[in-house]
């Protein structure tokens, strides 16, 4: 990735240098070093400050975004004197030609689409490409499928996420000939992307006074146990007047998922649907399919 | 219902091994992940280890590394923990449980605890 | 010595309203990790009372609440009953010991 780095030194410089692919910033050792700190500013002045690395030379910034662009500083005190460098890192190219819209969702347990647009001011021939890292950094991830409107990339389709970790960094890079794109980056918790499948293997058995539905927890991306699960269960009448409210009932996940409901012979024919959300960002996946139960003469 | 059924109590010699085993009925062993916990009237709860699924492994805790093994069969949904070279401060209950949540690990359910005495 | 610290214990009348702390760190709750808490009547397995810091199992009646702020977490019990005279465990992840840390348990008297 190419990017206009530019250090502000003092006459004696510590040639701080920063690698995007690792995120690691490192500078020059000084003997003697009583003192080492470094830490970026972002543009609305937030401050990161991540630990030195064991050498006390290099640190490595975790979560961090770059596109809005950030200025690294490195504070070096040795027996003799004090060091400070600041290196500026801006998202070089034309403002306005970085990706736009971005957004990923897994989805079936373990595929993922991620969309974006053109920027706004870039021009025709621009391309773009997807880069993805885990929060381990061990692996790079390239788009292995893009998905593309009138011959630029404006998605990706992955059909293998054995690299992803629970927390994830998207990068975005662009290239023309003509002027230099800017790029845009992004963290992601797959938890907060991942849409579940409706719950599966939907029964329901009824006797002479109650109806028991059960249900087996959707499969998942996430490793999730069933502790992690809220489902919401749809039992309707059927032909019942428009606008009649169908019951809706909040069920906990619990190791045999299960709800049992009063219902007593003759029963009128009834549907029951499922859907299942991640308990703690309650994104619910789309409806089980119907399930009837009782007859119409009931 | 799901139920956690662990062997019976056990009376070791210092510097033996003692394994410990924990059927699980209502459910396939394959689709859960079991943890082990022991308690002492004097430290407490101590959690050992289980199966972590960032890692996809069974992990333990550092405290009992290199002294403890964790096992399942999942064919007769049953999981085992050995502990070796036993000493008097590891007499406690033992405790396997099913792991509800992978967000703060809560318990749920229990075994009924199998008590392990050390003693010369 | 728990990681979590707890009170050894507490005490009152029948339908009062009791509640315990749990005081953790800045690896555990304050990671933030999830709080559970447990009942361990004499002689039994512990009994989930509460998971995801406030959230209650099926089959847990609502006299039993909790919450959690910072690095501590507590548990509400309203309406005190003499079957909740018992042992009370804090539970949380910790992020330096990679694994379960629990608190040194609180005995609930019911006077």
């Known amino acids: 990735e190419k990017s206009d780095l530019r250090t502000v030194a003092p006459a004696s410089s510590l040639n701080v240098r920063f690698d995007s692919r690792t995120m690691n910033l490192s500078w020059d050792c000084q003997e003697n070093t009583t003192f080492s700190k470094c830490f970026l500013t972002d543009k609305k002045n937030r401050v990161v400050e991540p630990r030195l690395s064991n050498n006390e030379c290099s640190c490595t910034f975790r979560e961090i975004c770059l596109h809005e662009g950030v200025t690294f500083e490195v504070h070096v005190n040795t027996s003799q004197r004090g060091f400070q460098q600041k290196l500026l890192y801006p998202n070089s190219g034309r403002e306005g030609t970085a990706a736009q819209n971005f957004s990923c969702f897994i989805y079936n347990a373990d595929l993922m689409n991620c969309t974006w647009a053109r920027g706004p001011t870039a021009p025709r021939d621009v391309q773009y490409f997807l880069y993805i890292r885990n929060s381990k950094r061990r692996r790079e991830i390239r788009c292995p499928y893009y998905i593309q409107d009138s011959g630029t990339h404006v998605g990706c389709h992955l059909d293998n996420l054995s690299g992803l970790t629970s927390r994830n960094y998207f990068l975005v890079n662009g290239t023309s000939r003509e002027i230099g794109i800017q790029f845009f980056d992004s963290l992601l918790d797959t938890k907060k992307i991942e849409r579940f499948n409706p719950p599966s293997n939907v029964t329901v058995r009824c006797n002479t006074t109650h109806c028991l539905v059960r249900w087996k927890q959707p499969r998942t991306y996430q490793k999730l146990s069933y502790l992690d699960f809220q489902y919401q269960l749809d039992v309707h009448r059927k032909n019942t007047q428009p606008g009649t409210e169908n019951l809706l009932i909040n069920v906990s996940g619990d190791l045999e998922n299960r709800y049992n409901f009063p219902s007593s012979e003759p029963r009128a024919k009834h549907s029951v649907k499922i859907r299942a959300a991640d308990v703690r960002i309650l994104n619910w996946s789309s409806w089980s399919e119907a399930i009837e139960f009782g007859s119409d003469d009931g | 219902q799901v139920q956690l059924v662990q062997s019976g109590a056990e009376v070791k010699k210092p510097g033996a091994s003692v394994k410990v085993s924990c059927k699980i009925s209502?459910?396939?062993?394959?689709?859960?992940?079991i943890h082990w916990v022991r308690q002492t009237p004097t430290k407490g709860f101590e959690w050992m280890g289980g199966?972590?699924?960032?890692?996809?492994?069974?992990v333990y805790a550092q405290r009992f590394q290199g002294r403890v093994t964790m096992t399942e069969d999942t064919s007769i949904d049953t999981a085992y923990l050995t502990l070796s070279s036993l000493r008097s401060d590891d007499t406690a209950v033992y405790y396997c449980?099913?792991?509800?949540?992978?967000?703060?690990?809560?318990?749920?359910?229990w075994g009924q605890g199998t008590m392990v005495t050390v003693s010369s | 010595q728990a990681v979590l610290t707890q009170p050894s214990s507490v005490s009152g009348a029948p339908g009062q309203r009791v509640t315990i702390s749990c005081t953790g760190s800045?690896?555990?709750?304050?990671?933030?990790?999830?709080v559970s808490w447990y009942q361990q009547l004499p002689g039994t397995a512990p009994k989930l009372l509460i998971y995801?810091?406030?959230k209650r199992p099926s089959g847990v009646p609502d006299r039993f609440s909790a919450s959690k702020s910072g690095t501590s977490a507590s548990l509400a019990i309203t309406g005190l009953q003499a079957d909740d005279e018992a042992d009370y465990y804090c539970?949380?992840?910790?992020?330096?010991?990679?694994?379960?840390?629990f608190g040194g348990g609180t005995k609930v008297t019911v006077l």
């Open positions: 800045g690896s555990n709750i304050g990671a933030p990790y999830d």
């Open positions: 539970q949380s992840y910790d992020s330096s010991l990679s694994g379960s840390v």
């Open positions: 449980a099913i792991v509800g949540s992978f967000s703060g690990y809560p318990y749920r359910p």
């Open positions: 995801h810091n406030n």
């Open positions: 209502g459910h396939s062993l394959s689709e859960l992940s």
């Open positions: 199966f972590d699924p960032e890692e996809n492994e069974i």
